[in-house]
Interface confidence: low
């Protein structure tokens, strides 16, 4: 690239001959005047490429003696107004002023866009004293300029509480287009329109944009930055980028992948974490989401039993966490479990089915036909019952628990008996005469104790009476 230095301030009055409007520091033979007495250089511009320095010369005005009141107004000399150069070049510019020697302690500060430049900047101030005046040249150099160096630079000098300000020097760093907004990756619905945005800036302006889809240009004619590309819809994944062009060349944005939303892949690795008599805790690993967030999942449960009707229970749950407690299951049953998840496009296929079993549970029904007799001759109570009738067992029956409560005036005592699973009768000793005995029976499995039967009461008289308690629950068919 060619580095340019353009002079756009008022022309120097002391240049012999016409001043060019634009000075190409790279390949133009530039004017150079000797440093004669009374003259000081006003501008030094140092390009990185070969070429002789440009030295503007400004006469320092004559002043009267130090005692005279007739001092000329102090002002910075005019210097170059506008410097245009390419990124990464070096630049040096200055401002100069002639100050009568009566003034002491003069300092020059540099400002950029209204803020003082402090610290580690390459600013050098040189003093050239003469009999009556001192020429002060403040130089400012920047190595390897960047876009952030663009701006308006001025010199300021304080004398006698007055501030003298130079004309601005505008630095314009030109380079390849710089993206301020690049297209973003997106997941889109198939055959649905969407927009991509690309914006790039110079200088130099203008910046023109070309769009590229899968390595092919989309627009024949460039669009001025910023550019919005409306894609009418895709049927398959595509990669888009944009090219930004200016006079310095071309910059290409990052390529962004536009994915087509699809139904998700089925979940994988369905696992059993915990089983109880009536619930199973499962987890799963979600499948690929099809470029669209999961909305919810469906847990499908089939009972694996030749006698079951093969119906599927469906439990809907949120997509996260990837865990669900399936409830309301039968005890001691085998189930086949699958998981499917959905996104905005639709449902995934079901995961591979896994087998799971519930554990033994407590019985769900009480024994039937509980009958209580008083066997007076033996001074005991005879209890009979029928095994609970259920279509399916909650577990292996291990026995029965008999509760008998004895109540007489002011006394109540509960006793518990356990009998084996093959029993359907039991005898208990009379605990108290002239009292009421209340009997309840529950079936017992390894999973726990089932519900107790309805209470059956029998009155135990003083010796000589007989009382008979009817069945608590009529057996089916025994009206």
């Amino acid at each position: 690239a060619i580095t340019e230095a353009r002079e756009e301030a008022k022309p120097y009055p002391l240049f012999p001959g016409p001043l060019p409007g634009s000075l190409q520091t790279d390949h133009t033979s530039l004017l150079s005047l000797p440093h004669t007495s009374g003259y000081q250089p006003a501008l030094m511009f140092s390009p990185t490429q070969p070429g002789r320095p440009y030295t503007g010369n400004v006469a320092i005005p004559r002043v009267t003696s130090a005692g005279s009141k007739l001092l000329p107004p102090l002002a910075f000399k005019h210097t170059v107004g506008h410097i245009i150069l390419s990124e990464h070049k070096d630049v040096k510019f200055n401002c100069s002023i002639s100050v009568p020697n009566i003034y002491q302690d003069t300092t020059i500060s540099w400002w950029k866009d209204g803020k003082e430049l402090l610290g580690a900047h390459h600013a050098i101030t040189q003093f050239y004293p003469d009999d009556e005046v001192t020429a002060i040249i403040a130089s400012f150099s920047i190595t390897s300029v960047q876009r952030s160096d663009n701006g308006s630079y001025i010199c300021k000098m304080k004398i006698n509480n007055e501030e003298i300000v130079s004309d601005p020097i505008y630095i314009e760093v030109q380079g390849l287009p710089h993206f301020t907004k690049q297209p973003e990756s997106m997941n889109v619905t198939r055959n649905t329109a969407f927009n991509l945005t690309c914006q790039a800036v110079g200088p130099p302006e203008p910046v023109n944009i070309f769009w590229v889809q899968n390595s092919s240009r989309v627009n024949e004619q460039p669009e001025k930055s910023p550019s919005v590309l409306t894609v009418p819809g895709l049927t398959e994944m595509a990669v888009f980028s944009c090219e930004a062009h200016n006079d310095k060349g071309l910059t290409v944005s990052k390529g962004v992948q536009i994915n087509i939303k699809a139904i998700p892949s089925p979940p994988t690795e369905v696992s059993i974490h915990n089983s109880t008599a009536h619930s199973i805790l499962i987890s799963w690993v979600p499948g690929f989401d099809g470029y669209s967030p999961f909305r919810n999942c469906s847990v499908q449960v089939k009972e694996v039993d030749p006698l079951s009707n093969g119906s599927v229970m469906i439990f809907n749950t949120s997509a996260s966490p990837h865990m669900y407690q399936i409830k309301q299951l039968q005890a001691l049953a085998n189930y086949s479990i699958g998981v499917s998840c959905m996104n905005e496009i639709g449902w995934s296929a079901v995961s591979p089915w896994i087998l799971a079993s519930t554990t033994e549970g407590a019985p769900s029904v009480a024994p039937l036909n509980v009958t209580v007799f008083l066997n007076e001759s033996r001074d005991n109570v005879d209890i009979r019952w029928m095994k609970p009738l259920t279509k399916r067992q909650a577990g292996e029956l291990v026995g029965y628990r008999i509760s008998h409560v004895w109540q007489s005036a002011g006394i109540s005592k509960e006793l518990l008996e356990e009998v084996g699973q093959n029993n359907s009768r039991a005898q208990i000793s009379v605990q108290v005469h002239n009292a009421t005995c209340t009997v309840r029976i529950a079936a017992v499995t390894k999973g726990g104790v089932g519900p107790f039967s309805d209470p059956v009461k029998i009155f135990i008289p003083a010796h000589g009476w007989v009382d008979h308690a009817p069945s608590s629950t009529p057996a089916p068919g025994n009206a």
Epitope: N191, I260, F288
Partner: antibody, heavy 120, light 108 residues
Framework: QVQLQQSGPELVKPGASVRLSCKAS????????INWVKQRPGLGLEWIGW????????KYNEKFKGRATLAVDTSSSTAYMELHSLTSEDSAVYFC?????????????WGQGTTLTVSS | EIVLTQSPTTVAASPGEKITITCSAS???????FHWYQQRPGFSPKLLIY???NLASGVPARFSGSGSGTSYSLTIGTMEAEDVATYYC?????????FGAGTKLELK
């Protein structure tokens, strides 16, 4: 369950055309692409193209462009492939497959295949 | 067109043996786009592994897949008689969708 039921074997003369069918069941027909794959005896599998039943969008393998035409009838959940200007090179088993969407493209279900014999 | 090269072309193995089939792609493919099929004699191909390493529904755990970039492989941990088939790799990254030429697995 998902099923793709293809039409029976065909014996046709060189230069003629033939239309093969593939009836889908057990899923929402318009959600997935239907693909067609060719397999010649002792040779590998060759993808012919797909059709997206929801809007009829088709994508062909350049090798089969102009020789194969894909179509669907959504009311009967049936996909069709017509092959034109047949030669002995077209003698093969043709499978219809369900495509698991185009940016991961794989074929999760396959029809049983239709045997096409081109002979004079 | 992405060309998939499978090797070996044929492999004979005894029951219980470990088998590895490789598939090399002519350009880099993300693992999401790489799949394997099994075709038993006289039957349609069947999806075996999708997205490089995910087992399709009903596929025994002795099958596994791995790979990235241009190199992918299918492994049968312990060969069984029912595994006699031709195995095909497939890429879903770009059209035309392409398959490998197949690896025929025979019983020794």
């Amino acid at each position: 369950q998902v099923q793709l039921q293809q039409s029976g074997p065909e014996l046709v003369k060189p230069g003629a055309s033939v239309r093969l069918s593939c009836k889908a069941s057990g899923y929402t027909f318009t959600t997935y692409d239907i693909n067609w794959v060719k397999q010649r005896p002792g040779l590998g599998l060759e993808w012919i193209g797909w059709i997206y039943p929801r809007d009829g969008y088709t994508k062909y393998n350049e090798k089969f462009k102009g020789r194969a035409t894909l179509a669907v009838d959504t009311s009967s959940s049936t996909a069709y492939m017509e092959l034109h200007s047949l030669t002995s090179e077209d003698s093969a088993v043709y499978f219809c497959t369900r495509g698991y969407y185009d940016n991961l493209y794989y074929f999760d279900y396959w029809g049983q295949g239709t045997t096409l014999t081109v002979s004079s | 067109e992405i060309v998939l090269t499978q090797s070996p072309t044929t492999v004979a193995a005894s029951p219980g043996e470990k088998i590895t089939i490789t598939c090399s792609a002519s350009s880099i493919i993300s693992s999401n786009y790489f799949h394997w099929y099994q075709q038993r004699p006289g039957f349609s191909p069947k999806l075996l592994i999708y997205r490089t390493s995910n087992l399709a529904s009903g596929v025994p755990a002795r099958f596994s897949g791995s790979g990235s970039g241009t190199s992918y492989s299918l492994t049968i941990g312990t060969m069984e008689a029912e595994d006699v088939a031709t195995y095909y790799c497939q890429q879903g990254r770009s059209v035309p969708l392409t398959f490998g030429a197949g690896t025929k697995l025979e019983l020794k």
